[in-house]
Interface confidence: medium
């Protein structure tokens, strides 16, 4: 009976040993699979993250396009309304002009002497830009970049004057240090009577004959409202 029990124990040990080996093999297999699954999950996660990022970028880009489209549509519908109506109000900016804070701005890409630039703007029923705030200064500066550009400020008849009658003394100023200096040392005859934005945006007085770029500005009429989008 004892030998029978020993035989059974041997059998059980063998079975258990097989079971252990088999279980170990399965655990090993599972851990390998687990590693694969983990890697796969990581890969899927990063793919998902990339897709989300792409989607987010596409969404932002689409939003910009939609915004631009709405703006263009509003501008076009406004101009259509202006053409169809017979009122004398200027309710929206013309094509190629930039609207900002109820004014329209046009930025030249060529150069003219100050008087010619002034004349050009007047022939657009507008005037050389008149800067009335730091906010407007930043807006204009952003559009012209680091390029000498005429503005609607001069002292050709004595005191400094804005072309639209805005008071110079009490108004916004952004001169470079030690400017205006009415410098005579340029050898071109006379002093410096016309103001321009310099490469850093601050103002300088210069010889009015220099062929600088310029900015025209015209105000939208006070009573005007944005037309509904059709």
């Amino acid at each position: 009976q004892n030998s029978q029990l020993q035989e059974e124990l041997r059998g059980l040990r063998e079975t258990f040993s097989n079971f252990t080996a088999s279980t170990e093999a399965q655990v090993k297999g599972l851990s390998t699979q687990g590693g694969n699954v983990g890697r796969k999950m990581k890969s899927l996660e990063s793919q998902l993250e990339k897709q989300q990022k792409d989607l987010s970028e596409d969404h932002s880009s689409l939003l910009l396009h939609v915004k631009q489209f709405v703006s263009d549509l509003r501008s076009l519908s406004c101009q259509m309304a202006a053409l169809q109506g017979n009122g004398s109000e200027r309710t929206c900016c013309p094509v190629n002009w930039v609207e900002h804070e109820r004014s329209c701005y046009w930025f030249s890409r060529s150069g003219k002497a100050w008087a010619d630039a002034d004349n050009y703007c007047r022939l657009e029923d507008a005037h050389l830009v008149v800067v009335t705030s730091w906010e407007e200064q930043k807006f204009v500066q952003h559009h012209i970049g680091p390029v000498n550009t005429w503005m609607g400020l001069h002292d050709q008849n004595g005191p400094w004057k804005w072309v639209d009658g805005t008071d110079y003394e009490t108004g916004f100023k952004n001169w470079r240090p030690e400017q205006p200096d009415d410098w005579y040392g340029h050898g071109l005859g006379g002093g410096e009577d016309c103001a321009h934005f310099t490469d850093d945006g601050r103002w300088n007085d210069d010889v009015c004959q220099r062929p600088y770029r310029w900015v025209c500005e015209t105000e939208l009429d006070k009573a005007s409202q944005e037309p509904p989008l059709l």
Epitope: A82, L83, N86, N96, W106, S110, Y120
Partner: antibody
């Protein structure tokens, strides 16, 4: 349809004044500049000046400065050109013309009136 | 003021000919130039604006070229109705000067 219709022919004495009208129709009068151009017999075209009816801003050629006055009546969509101190050399056909596209970098005269003959003779 | 020199002042040509009229400007006016056609007793008619753009309703045999100081009006194949006087005009500040004109006559 855009149309510019001018007043009829005039015969004037030297030293007097003439006022020519130009009635616009078919578009928003205040949205475009109106220009005046003259042409003496057998001669070329000569620009005289411009008005923006929206703002009443005017521009005149140096040659006519002080003798010419351009005005606009928004209520009747009519532009006027008055030339004073007339001389025999002012005998010409006077045209009004719409300046196409009030804005942007390139302009042009896209519509013209039929012309008004002004004869200055004693 | 800007000076305009249009040439030739007169020109004889036949139906079917290719004709070129030039306009030279005293300073750079970029593309701010228009061309007009005028027939006797009539108001001028816009042909080309902004140097190269064909005005509405103008036949495609008319074309404009150039920028800066030198501009050209070309008629590729003259038609009987094209015999008239042609003018260039600049729009680079006032005065909006016209060229002296080119009279195109039948040979």
């Amino acid at each position: 349809e855009v149309q510019l219709v001018q007043s009829g022919a005039e015969v004037k004495k030297p030293g007097s004044s003439v006022k020519v009208s130009c009635k616009a129709s078919g578009y928003t009068f205040t949205a475009y500049g109106i220009n005046w151009v003259r042409q003496a017999p057998g001669q070329g075209l000569e620009w005289m000046g411009e008005i923006f009816p929206r703002s009443d801003n005017t521009f005149y050629a140096q040659k006519f400065q002080g003798r010419v006055t351009i005005t606009a009546d928004k209520s009747t969509s009519t532009a006027y050109m008055e030339l004073s101190s007339l001389r025999s050399e002012d005998t010409a056909v006077y045209y009004c013309a719409r300046k196409g596209r009030e804005y942007g970098t390139s302009h042009y005269f896209d519509y013209w009136g039929q012309g008004t003959t002004v004869t200055v003779s004693s | 003021d800007i000076q305009m020199t249009q040439s030739p002042s007169s020109l004889s040509a036949s139906v079917g000919d290719r004709v070129t009229i030039t306009c030279r400007i005293s300073e750079n006016i970029y593309s701010n130039l228009a061309w007009y056609q005028q027939k006797p007793g009539k108001a001028p008619k816009l042909l080309i604006y902004a140097a190269i753009n064909l005005a509405e309703g103008v036949p495609s045999r008319f074309s404009g070229s150039g920028s800066g100081t030198d501009f050209t009006l070309t008629i590729s194949s003259l038609q009987p109705e094209d015999f008239a006087t042609y003018y260039c005009q600049h729009f680079w500040g006032t005065p909006f000067t016209f060229g002296q004109g080119t009279k195109l006559e039948i040979k």
